[in-house]
């Protein structure tokens, strides 16, 4: 199709080489078309348009994305050629940064239902650059945490070194939805709820004498509970003796509950005590069996191919540790009579 009639938008993604970050493009179809495809309606009830050319569908995924190759080749369907780019409803997600993402991206409705639809498309010219200026040492992260139940804030990474006074007007989105009243480089969250978790996008306009473009950054916001003040507790084994059959295989499971920590480095291991000697056993990797907002239950098993007489004289000790402290639980094997 002819893309010369598409509205054009220029965007800049300046990515940090020291952190993982994502990027998004919205299919900003002209109003009122957008509302029929993306359910991101911003019309007031009084702004009813003269004609509604895009009555075709209310399916949220009813837009098609293409990339325009720089060599003039035909448009390429994003889904077929770019595995690191994912389409979600009317949003294009770039999972990895890199200058190779620079280029022209075009979106338009899949279903063309009227003569007006032909020109209903948006061309986004994306320029991707690594961050060069080290002048701002403490720029906000692309991953930000909000503590549940307290007051918090979400900062726009590309503007976090500027004071509120000198900051340009910012446009914020949460999970693709415009937050029309948020215009500063920092959103204050009076009281944090689970609701506040999500993908936030902040845009501002930059211009020189020739043209203007939108500078965009994406922030993944996670809602968390406060760091635990407790050391982990061992849920299993509970008993300190275990009846076993000699010559049979045996698996002893150690399950421990670790409270939430922002920097989480749980330790769960088995070691064996035999008279004055003790040594760590090489056992299968630990695995998380339950994870909630407040805590995580991690399990690690020790496997004996067959129980020997010698094993009855040993103590099998599960050791668990977090930043607060450690807990142990020992098990003595006893022959079944």
């Amino acid at each position: 199709f002819n893309i010369s009639g598409c509205s054009t938008k220029k965007l800049l993604w300046t990515y940090s080489t020291r952190s993982e970050e994502e990027f998004v493009l919205f299919c900003d179809l002209p109003e009122p078309q957008k509302s029929h495809f993306c359910h991101r309606n911003r019309l007031s009830p009084k702004q009813v348009p003269e004609h509604l050319p895009f009555m075709g569908s209310n399916d949220l995924s009813d837009v098609q994305w293409y990339q325009q190759p720089s060599n003039g080749d035909p448009l390429e369907d994003i889904r077929k050629s770019y595995p690191h780019i994912i389409q979600d409803k009317c949003t294009l997600h770039f999972l990895t940064p890199g200058v190779n993402n620079s280029g022209s991206y075009i979106c338009r409705p899949k279903m063309i239902k009227s003569p007006y639809d032909v020109a209903c498309c948006v061309k986004m010219i994306l320029e991707v650059k690594p961050q060069t200026n080290a002048s701002c040492e403490y720029s906000a992260s692309h991953k930000q945490d909000l503590l549940l139940g307290s007051t918090g804030s979400i900062s726009c990474p590309s503007l976090s070194c500027q004071s509120d006074a000198q900051s340009p007007a910012v446009t914020w989105y949460k999970n693709g939805k415009l937050l029309s009243v948020e215009r500063s480089n920092r959103i204050v969250v009076d009281e944090v709820y689970d609701y506040h978790q999500g993908t936030y996008v902040c845009d501002y306009t930059q211009s020189d004498t020739v043209s203007s473009w939108t500078v965009r950054a994406v922030v993944q916001v996670r809602t968390i509970v406060g760091d635990t003040k407790l050391k982990p507790d061992i849920l299993d084994p509970v008993e300190d003796t275990l009846e076993v059959e000699l010559g049979k295989p045996l698996t002893i499971s150690c399950k421990a509950r670790f409270g939430f920590e922002r920097v989480f480095n749980p330790v769960i291991k088995w070691y064996i005590k035999d008279s004055d000697l003790e040594w760590e056993v090489s056992v299968p990797e630990a695995k998380s069996i339950k994870s909630t907002l407040k805590d995580e239950i991690i399990e690690r098993n020790i496997i004996l191919e067959k129980v020997t007489q010698r094993d009855l004289r040993r103590k099998f000790v599960c050791f668990v540790q977090n930043s607060i402290g450690n807990t142990t639980q020992s098990v003595q094997l006893k022959e079944k009579r």
């Epitope: 991101r40 307290s150 007051t151 949460k174 939805k177 937050l179 959103i187 204050v188 009281e191």
Partner: antibody, heavy 117, light 111 residues
Framework: SLEESGGDLVKPGASLTLTCTAS?????????MCWVRQAPGKGLEWIAC????????TYYASWAKGRFTISKTSSTTVTLQMTSLTAADTATYFC???????????WGPGTLVTVSS | DVVMTQTPASVSEPVGGTVTIKCQAS??????LAWYQQKPGQPPKLLIY???TLASGVPSRFKGSGSGTQFTLTIGDLECADAATYFC?????????????FGGGTEVVVK
């Protein structure tokens, strides 16, 4: 309960401060203390809210910015300062303790402000 | 600011009848909408919050529905005591749960 005070008959161009006093509770996190007005025979009109928690954030209807100022003055009082009053500001002014999306809603009986020459 | 448009301005129904009031938001407010009942000389009384959750003590004849930009309040099995003015209110402002813009109101007359 909540009680508004400070309503009066004033001349156009005058300023007035309304006070909302809480009894039986003190303002705390989770609550927004708000002012809403209602002109005689008309609908409810949101003016402003202040968050009672640590951020102390204030929120205004776009038409109220500049002329109206909401403040939490103590743990049991909130004020609304109004300047350059006109006849269009004649209304009953309600104070409310509220939080969106919850069952927490408490309103005062209202105080009448009349602006007339 | 969000603009809340409420229809109709007035409705008259007999006792035992059903009234439907609509409220349209100028932008997506998810389910952050409350409905209030107000009688002359009194402050408003909360009926419904989060678009469809009944406030305590409110009879189940009151039903709220909708999300995004379109919301409805339905009053079934009308009683004389339901004669009042009803208002919708948006209860989110940016990312904060701040009660703000009201609809213009609907006067319900019970015949």
């Amino acid at each position: 309960s909540l009680e508004e005070s400070g309503g009066d008959l004033v001349k156009p161009g005058a300023s007035l401060t309304l006070t909302c006093t809480a009894s039986g509770f003190s303002f705390s996190s989770s609550y927004y203390m708000c002012w809403v007005r209602q002109a005689p025979g008309k609908g409810l009109e949101w003016i402003a809210c202040v968050y009672a928690g640590s951020s102390g954030s204030t929120y205004y209807a776009s038409w109220a910015k500049g002329r109206f100022t909401i403040s939490k003055t103590s743990s049991t009082t909130v004020t609304l300062q109004m300047t350059s009053l006109t006849a269009a500001d004649t209304a009953t002014y309600f104070c409310a303790r509220d939080r969106g999306g919850t069952d927490i809603s408490l309103w005062g009986p209202g105080t009448l402000v009349t602006v007339s020459s | 600011d969000v603009v809340m448009t409420q229809t109709p301005a007035s409705v008259s129904e007999p006792v035992g009848g059903t009234v439907t009031i609509k409220c349209q938001a100028s932008e997506d407010i998810e389910s952050f909408l409350a409905w209030y009942q107000q009688k002359p000389g009194q402050p408003p009384k909360l009926l419904i919050y989060s678009a469809s959750t009944l406030a305590s003590g409110v009879p189940s004849r009151f039903k709220g529905s909708g999300s995004g930009t379109q919301f409805t309040l339905t009053i079934g099995d009308l009683e004389c005591a339901d004669a009042a003015t009803y208002f919708c209110q948006c209860t989110i402002y940016g990312v904060n749960f701040v009660p703000n813009a009201f609809g213009g109101g609907t006067e319900v007359v019970v015949k």
